[in-house]
Interface confidence: low
């Protein structure tokens, strides 16, 4: 079953490579179990960069080694991405599944275009 | 299509402990999702865990600090070491694999397994 997610459109990542985006879900159901995955479009090409699955209420957590972070608070999932650079400029699509109950229920957002600028190395100082 | 066969249950005195195993066999999609979920009589059936390799593995917080989810290397098996356990943690518990993908490829159930906790 299909369900509207919500996303904004453009994002630009700060100086240190981290870019922030609230992923929001219209929950037809009471779920107890959810799970988001965060795909990235380029070139054609899609890609997982992360996922995790929470329960309602609880906190949102990824793997020790994910560039992900986030939190959760009802229907909208906030989320960090950390450690960008430029080429990883493009389209991130936030998937949101509630795994149970049933029924499944499917939203996947249009996606949040991420742009990644590298900071200029800095000058070399006298110093 | 994917069969689940749960083992490792029976009856235990509260304070005791259980380790339930489910192995999945046939033609898996990966990434895929395994949990387990547990059905009490006269109740809805609850996740009480769920172990992703993509994901973080969560628990039910009923069963926090004192069941532990793990699968073996080849993620074919998945296993719940069920430590301290009370007589409300009676009931049939169910594994269940999930394949994902941009969709939900397939759900699938074992039959269950009965857990009774009483002396």
């Known amino acids: 079953k299909a369900m509207h997610v919500a996303q904004p459109a453009v994002v630009l990542a700060s100086s240190r490579g981290i870019a922030s985006f609230v992923c929001e879900y219209a929950s037809p159901g009471k779920a107890t179990e959810v799970r988001v995955t965060v795909l990235r479009q380029a070139d054609s090409q899609v890609t997982e960069v992360c996922a995790a699955t929470y329960m309602m209420g609880n906190e949102l957590t990824f793997l020790d080694d994910s560039i992900c972070t986030g939190t959760s608070s009802g229907n909208q999932v906030n989320l960090t991405i950390q450690g960008l650079r430029a080429m990883d400029t493009g389209l991130y699509i936030c998937k949101v599944e509630l795994m149970y109950p049933p029924p499944y229920y499917l939203g996947i957002g249009n996606g949040t275009q991420i742009y990644v600028i590298d900071p200029e190395p800095c000058p070399d100082s006298d110093f | 299509e994917v069969q689940l066969q749960e083992s490792g249950g029976g009856l235990v005195q509260p304070g005791g402990s259980l380790r339930l195993s489910c192995v999945a066999s046939?033609?898996?999609?990966?990434?895929?999702?395994m949990g387990w979920y547990r059905q009490a009589p006269g109740k809805q059936r609850e996740l009480v865990a769920t172990n992703s390799k993509g994901g973080s593995t969560i628990y039910a917080d009923a069963v926090k600090g004192r069941f532990t989810i793990s699968s073996d290397n080849d993620e074919n098996t998945v296993y719940l070491q069920m430590n301290s356990l009370k007589p409300e943690d009676t009931a049939v518990y169910y594994c269940?694999?999930?394949?994902?993908?941009?969709?939900?490829?397939?759900?699938?159930w074992g039959q269950g397994t009965q857990v009774t906790v009483s002396s």
């Open positions: 046939g033609s898996i999609f990966r990434p895929y999702v």
């Open positions: 269940n694999l999930k394949e994902l993908g941009i969709y939900l490829r397939g759900d699938y």
